[in-house]
């Protein structure tokens, strides 16, 4: 919650000094603190601009001062406005001239909607005219001269939320800078109700704390702090967490504080007067002295906080036995903390009487979020409560406020946090060198993005096309070396930077790819892999020259793709081919070579053959007439693969003639899949037919096709193949 | 942070009556206003009455007024609900609770009351 | 008195996926003072009283975990659980403070898929 103070030293105007300080109370505004003057609440006031300073003496406030030869132009009304995450409060104030005709009760005044109300000004001149009241600037009310009495009074019988204001009295000879000004605040609600509709129960606000009307939470008075005000701030010290500090000799002498609406203004516990700078008499303490101390066991009342209580014996009357309270302490956390960008788990850390509950704890971003305990534990003596921001970002820098508010008070810490970019390297690492099993590398870790000092090196490196896990080893020095590598393997790499603190590792750099050398001889040059029969295959190869004196030998492999069967076979090194038999007929084998000496060489690409087949072929398939002419036409099929297909022919005859009056064209190369008829006559039927040969013998076509060529004149045309049964 | 400890369901019969109690501990009792709300066997939630912190301002729902009584005893950190005329449709759990603003943040751990004959 | 209407009655997600949660006022709850909204959201477990969730409609209660979120305004509104734990397993009810009697939506069973 937003804790906003407007402190007014002194609101009656002399000669002297005086000026309006605005605290933001543990909190940072996203907006600077403005002070204003109050037209709202006074039109007619001095026009001239204010000038606001940032007091010197906290972190978060804003100040005006005037001279004491600047007294003609102070009286008016005034605000202190400031702003986070959208919400705005406002707090008013006023300022009047000690030497007015009049002086107010009070500042201000707050009551409840439906309560009886007296607005009452003392009369400090005497003067032979009439007194005016005003309400906002504006005339309500006059008293004939003759009846001015010593408190000139404004009834309210049933004060509605319309009766609040600025109200003002003056002779009516008189002016701004002769009036007395009183606030009127009214709580929209009727007592101890709050809600749009004023249809909830307040809870009691202790202290003379007000109950706000639209959240139904306690605004308590200076010196104060708690869910319900109960418990008394340390000496001098004031806020919602009683952290600020009235640094005057007399502690809050002369000081009036100005709370949001509905407080209003009021002197610190112990003080009381327009100038708050009056003590409380015996007996009584609190804001403006209007607490009495009803101390159960004759126990002292301090002025400031009321009945202290003996050991044993608490509560504002000290009624009520129990271990006393114990403000609540926030220990072992350090001003300024460095994080690295990512998970964080910041620890808040208190003592106190109760313990504070894992509830009661929290930690305000510098934005003004308030996060909560995910974890929390306590030992006899400390609650620690553990947040968790998942993904922390240097945005998320600055002040940072530990939080707890028991039943025994509030306190807060503020810490800086300063969120660091993970380091990340520029560039790639270069490769100096490679071997079949080593590489040295330059890792080349600066210039890098981010954050240093770099408390540490990694370099990442795994096989390309592996799904293996990154390898890592720590490195010191710019230039280092991998060892026991696989040769002839792509390797990709690069280079982790690890800066101080928990989570420091950052991002991998850029990859950098490279190749290990080979090892051993390369492959037989020149390898064909072609059938020999049904049941074997033949690989050969040139002739290999070994360039040392090492034995070699080639070492074949091969493998069904159809089944899952392979065999390796050894070949002394003077030969040049390997018969492959036990194979099954129309079987694809996959066949590579290798030459070998002590250590292995490189494996050669596959080869692919069938063995031969032991059956007919099957017919070509998809056979279509295309591009038909007069004198010619396109004949196009498939056949299927491992069937030892070694030739096709096409056999064309004129409708009608004789079975042995065909022509027979013959495709030698079974890859071919098309081929063009030519020297046909115009406007002829023919029979075609196509057979596919192997080892074994023709395929048995089931029917015939048709082919007509056009006559002379006409353009080509396409035949689907009409079928003619034979 | 208060800590709430209910006592006094049971079986009664319709037309009789019962008192609920709720015990507070820890954080100034007399500070806060306190409620009870109820929740039939199966059903949500239903709130049944309020109190001021001071015992001042009562008031209830539409389905008992006139019926049920709250109370305190802030010298004794003490709630009660005087429950009478009983129907069977006022059988349910119980729960005292106080309030934040207007949200419920502390709970009993709820009293059966059960009404049949 | 304002009527509070939550849907679906009841709803199965598997662990670890988003659950969202709706609730519909029969008139706006967002005071334009302050711009709050007064609704409330409640987590209850078998045999337990009720657990505040959420009040002002968005503002986590102390020690409820950030995969709860809450959001809506004026008539509007949802509650979501980013990624469904076991433990989230429970009724979940919303309750208007606007205006006196306070009142509670019908409830929302959340069981796993």
């Known amino acids: 919650a937003m804790d906003l103070i407007l402190i007014n030293s002194l609101p009656l105007v002399s000669d002297a000094e005086t000026s309006l300080t605005c605290i933001a109370s543990g909190w940072r505004p996203h907006e600077p603190i403005t002070i204003g003057r109050d037209f709202e609440a006074l039109m007619n006031q001095h026009q001239d601009p204010l000038e606001v300073t940032q007091d010197v003496t906290r972190e978060w406030a804003k100040k005006v001062v005037w001279k004491r030869e600047k007294a003609s132009k102070i009286n008016g009304a005034y605000f202190c406005e400031g702003r986070v995450r959208g919400e705005a409060i406002r707090i008013r104030t006023m300022k009047m001239r000690q030497q007015a005709s009049f002086l107010p009760a009070t500042l201000t005044m707050t009551v409840d909607k439906g309560d009886n109300v007296n607005i009452s000004f003392k009369k400090v001149l005497i003067k032979e005219e009439d007194a005016v009241i005003y309400k906002n600037g504006s005339f309500i009310h006059s008293v004939p001269r003759h009846e001015v009495p010593d408190i000139l009074e404004v009834h309210l019988p049933h004060a509605q939320p319309q009766d609040a204001g600025v109200y003002s009295a003056r002779y009516i000879g008189g002016n701004l800078f002769t009036s007395a000004f009183t606030r009127l605040i009214v709580r929209r609600c009727e007592a101890q109700k709050w809600g749009p509709e004023c249809n909830h129960l307040c809870t009691a606000c202790m202290n003379n704390g007000v109950c706000h009307e639209d959240t139904g939470e306690c605004i308590c008075p200076p010196g104060f702090m708690g869910r319900t005000c109960e418990k008394a701030c340390e000496l001098h010290t004031f806020g919602r967490t009683c952290k600020e500090r009235c640094s005057g000799q007399e502690g809050c002498k002369s000081y009036v504080f100005c709370l949001p609406d509905p407080y209003g203004c009021s002197c610190a516990t112990g003080w009381k007067g327009l100038q708050c700078n009056e003590a409380c008499h015996p007996g009584f303490y609190g804001p403006d002295c209007k607490l009495r101390c009803s101390c159960n066991n004759g126990e002292m009342c301090d002025r400031f906080q009321g009945c202290l209580c003996s050991p044993g014996w608490q509560g504002l009357q000290c009624e009520r036995e129990g271990i006393p309270r114990m403000t609540p302490k926030i220990v072992d956390l350090p001003d300024h903390i460095e994080v690295n960008s990512g998970k964080f788990n910041p620890i808040c850390k208190a003592s106190g009487w109760p313990l504070p509950t894992n509830e009661e704890m929290t930690l305000v971003k510098p934005d003004g979020t308030v996060l909560h305990p995910k974890d929390f534990n306590h030992t006899d003596h400390f609650s620690v409560a553990i947040f968790t921001i998942h993904r922390i970002l240097p945005p998320d820098s600055g002040v940072w406020v530990c939080s707890v508010n028991t039943v025994a008070g509030m306190v807060e810490k503020p810490f800086n946090i300063s969120v660091k970019v993970l380091p990340k390297p520029l560039n790639a690492p270069n490769v100096i060198d490679t071997g079949h099993n080593f590489a040295v590398i330059n890792i080349s870790s600066e210039p890098y993005f981010g954050d240093g000092p770099i408390k540490s090196k990694k370099l990442l490196y795994k096989p390309v096309n592996h799904y293996e896990a990154w390898q890592h080893i720590q490195v010191t020095n710019e230039i280092v070396t991998l060892n026991y590598l696989e040769p002839r393997t792509e390797y990709e790499l690069c280079v982790q930077l690890v800066r101080r603190g928990e989570g420091g590792e950052g991002h991998p750099g850029p990859v950098r790819r490279f190749t290990t050398a080979s090892i051993g001889l390369p492959p037989p040059r020149g390898l064909n892999l072609l059938p020999k029969s049904q049941t074997t295959l033949n690989l050969t190869w040139q002739p290999i020259f070994p360039s040392s004196e090492d034995d070699f030998y080639v070492e074949v492999e091969r493998r069904s793709v159809q089944k899952s069967d392979q065999q390796n076979i050894k070949v002394p090194g003077n030969l040049t081919s390997v018969l492959l038999n036990n194979l099954h007929p129309r079987e694809q084998y996959v066949v590579r070579a290798r030459v070998n000496t002590k250590a292995q060489g490189e494996w050669s690409e596959d080869l692919t053959a069938w063995t031969l087949s032991d059956i007919l072929p099957p017919q070509p398939e998809n056979i279509k007439i295309s591009n038909i002419t007069h004198s010619s036409a396109v004949i196009s099929w498939t056949i299927l693969d491992g069937y030892s297909i070694s030739s096709i022919t096409i056999r064309y005859k004129v409708q009608g003639k004789n079975e042995d009056q065909h022509v027979d064209v013959k495709i030698k190369n079974a890859t071919i899949t098309q081929y063009q008829l030519k020297g046909l006559e115009p406007e002829t039927a023919y029979q075609v037919d196509i057979f596919a040969e192997n080892n074994i013998g023709s395929s048995n076509p089931a029917f015939s096709h048709e082919l007509v060529t056009l006559p002379e004149s006409q353009a080509p045309a396409d035949l689907g193949g009409g079928k003619m049964l034979l | 942070q208060v800590q709430l400890v209910q006592s006094g369901g049971g079986v009664v019969q319709p037309g009789r009556s019962l008192r609920l109690s709720c015990a507070a501990s820890?954080?100034?009792?007399?500070?806060?206003?306190m409620h009870w709300v109820r929740q039939a066997p199966g059903k949500g939630l239903e709130w049944v009455a309020v109190?001021?912190?001071?015992?001042?301002?009562?008031y209830y729902a539409d389905s008992v007024k006139g019926r049920f009584t709250i109370s305190r005893d802030n010298s004794k950190n003490m709630l009660q609900l005087q429950m009478n005329r009983l129907r069977s449709e006022d059988t349910a759990v119980y729960y005292c609770a106080t309030p934040k603003g207007g949200a419920l943040e502390i709970w009993g751990q709820g009293t059966v009351i059960t009404v049949s004959s | 008195d304002i009527q509070m209407t939550q849907s679906p009655d009841s709803l199965a997600v598997s662990l670890g996926e988003r659950a969202t949660i709706n609730c519909k006022s029969s008139?706006?709850?967002?005071?334009?003072?302050?711009?709050?909204?007064?609704l409330a959201w409640y987590q209850q477990k078998p045999g337990q009283p009720p657990n505040l969730l959420m009040y002002?409609?968005?503002t986590r209660e102390s020690g409820v975990p950030d995969r709860f979120s809450g959001s809506g305004s004026g008539t509007d509104f949802t509650l979501t659980i980013s990624s469904l734990q076991a433990e989230d397993v429970a009724v979940y009810y919303c309750q208007q403070y606007y205006s006196a009697p306070i009142t509670f939506g019908q409830g929302t069973r959340l069981e796993i898929k």
């Open positions: 109190i001021s912190y001071d015992g001042e301002n009562k």
């Open positions: 002002w409609a968005s």
């Open positions: 008139q706006s709850v967002l005071y334009s003072s302050n711009n709050k909204n007064y």
């Open positions: 820890g954080a100034t009792f007399s500070n806060y206003a």
